[in-house]
């Protein structure tokens, strides 16, 4: 799966949008979850309303909002009040029992408010020396990753 | 009419490969999983994997990974399940099947609600 | 896997009798189950899907019942043309798996 990156400004509302075969996807109901390392288990955020016929219902965990547009096939995640601990690589998912397929892997950067002037050295995005692989780019702001970036900061 | 036609009986000898068919019609191939099941003789049903023609997205039961091919070419809305070397215990039906799309209450599923007719494979020295 | 686990394997029953097979799944597998007949000689047909939802052509005497890990066939009176076999197929997970079959005799 090539990895698309979806740029927000920091205390603004992101949203991202998977687009999916909804034919192929057809009853199956929906999930948004956080990677934990380049290697780790993806940790579920939110999903999708319990009852398939209802997933277009927007269901909240926090400050993410799932809702899933199941004939249109799009599935849409709000992240609202987006803060700079909110970067970092996500998935959209298709649930099939209690396995997943993967509809696509997002990367969400966070960006300075140009109107706030606190310190935003804890903002983190890619910088142009870091890269990663299979990357493509879609504006909402979005792009996807240039070939060789990496989704994760470098660890000290 | 909606239906699965199956390629006819085949007698093959061991270590021979083979390719079967499922032609389908009267519906939109390419947006239905279509699965395959095998029927040795005397015995039950045993399911062997699944394909999404749209997009080749095949998954195969462990049972069977490795031991078939299961592939598909949707601008004919045929479906394929095949052996490189065949083996006497490879003798069976086989059936392809089309997992229709059911809304039942509030949820949506799946059944195989389209049957090919069956295709007979002997295996034998 | 999920084991999907059918009994009676076989069963002697008579014209006019109420019968009743089950099928156990090995984990919870919500109700997405389906009930199937197979004739001597021919593909299977569906008769049930999502634990208790009669196909389209299917008689009302047969029903469906379960949720989670216990589901349940009942044909309320038997017709010469139900003596076969019956299958339940979970499609919860891959790999999809049948039950082992039961068996439906005239006595």
């Known amino acids: 799966h090539n990895t698309t990156v979806f740029q927000g400004v920091a205390g603004q509302s992101l949203q991202v949008s998977c687009p999916y075969d909804s034919m192929k996807h057809w009853g199956r109901r929906k999930a948004w979850c956080r990677q934990l390392g380049e290697k780790g288990p993806c940790q579920r955020v939110v999903s999708t309303h319990n009852l398939w016929l209802l997933s277009f219902l927007r269901r909240w965990n926090g400050s993410t909002a799932i809702t899933d547009d199941t004939l249109g096939g799009t599935l849409t995640i709000t992240l609202r009040n987006l803060q700079p601990h909110d970067a970092g690589l996500y998935q959209c998912q298709s649930l099939h029992g209690s396995e997943a397929d993967t509809l696509r892997k997002v990367l969400v950067e966070v960006l300075a408010d140009p109107l706030d002037h606190r310190d935003a050295g804890d903002l983190w995005f890619p910088g142009e020396s870091e890269s990663f692989e299979d990357a493509h780019v879609e504006h909402s702001i979005s792009r996807s990753l240039l070939e060789g970036e990496i989704p994760f900061p470098p660890t000290s | 009419e909606v239906q699965l036609v199956q390629s006819g009986a085949e007698v093959k000898k061991p270590g021979e490969s083979l390719k079967i068919s499922c032609k389908g019609s009267g519906f939109s191939f390419n947006t239905y999983w279509i699965g395959w099941v095998r029927q040795m003789p005397g015995k039950g049903l045993e399911w062997m994997g699944i394909?999404?023609?749209?997009?080749?997205?095949?998954r195969y039961s462990p049972s069977f990974q490795g031991q078939v091919t299961i592939s598909a070419d949707k601008s004919i809305s045929t479906a394929y399940l095949q052996w490189s070397s065949l083996k006497a215990s490879d003798t069976a039906m086989y059936y392809c099947?089309?997992?229709?799309?059911?809304?039942?209450?509030?949820?949506?599923?799946?059944?195989?609600?389209?049957w090919g007719q069956g295709t007979t494979v002997t295996v034998s020295s | 896997d999920i084991q999907m686990t059918q009994s009676p394997s076989s069963l002697s029953a008579s014209v006019g009798d109420r019968v009743t097979i089950t099928c156990r799944a090995s984990?919870?597998?919500?109700?997405?189950l389906g009930w199937y007949q197979q004739k001597p000689g021919k593909a299977p047909k569906l008769l049930i899907y999502a634990a208790s939802s009669l196909q389209s052509g299917v008689p009302s005497r047969f029903s469906g019942s379960g949720s989670g890990t216990d589901f349940t066939l009942t044909i309320s009176s038997l017709q010469p043309e139900d003596f076969a076999t019956y299958y339940c197929?979970?499609?919860?997970?891959?790999?999809?798996?049948f039950g082992q079959g039961t068996k439906l005799e005239i006595k």
């Open positions: 984990q919870a597998i919500r109700d997405d």
């Open positions: 394909i999404y023609p749209g997009d080749q997205d095949i």
């Open positions: 197929l979970q499609n919860y997970n891959y790999p999809h798996t």
């Open positions: 099947a089309r997992y229709g799309r059911y809304i039942y209450g509030y949820g949506g599923y799946h059944g195989m609600d389209v």
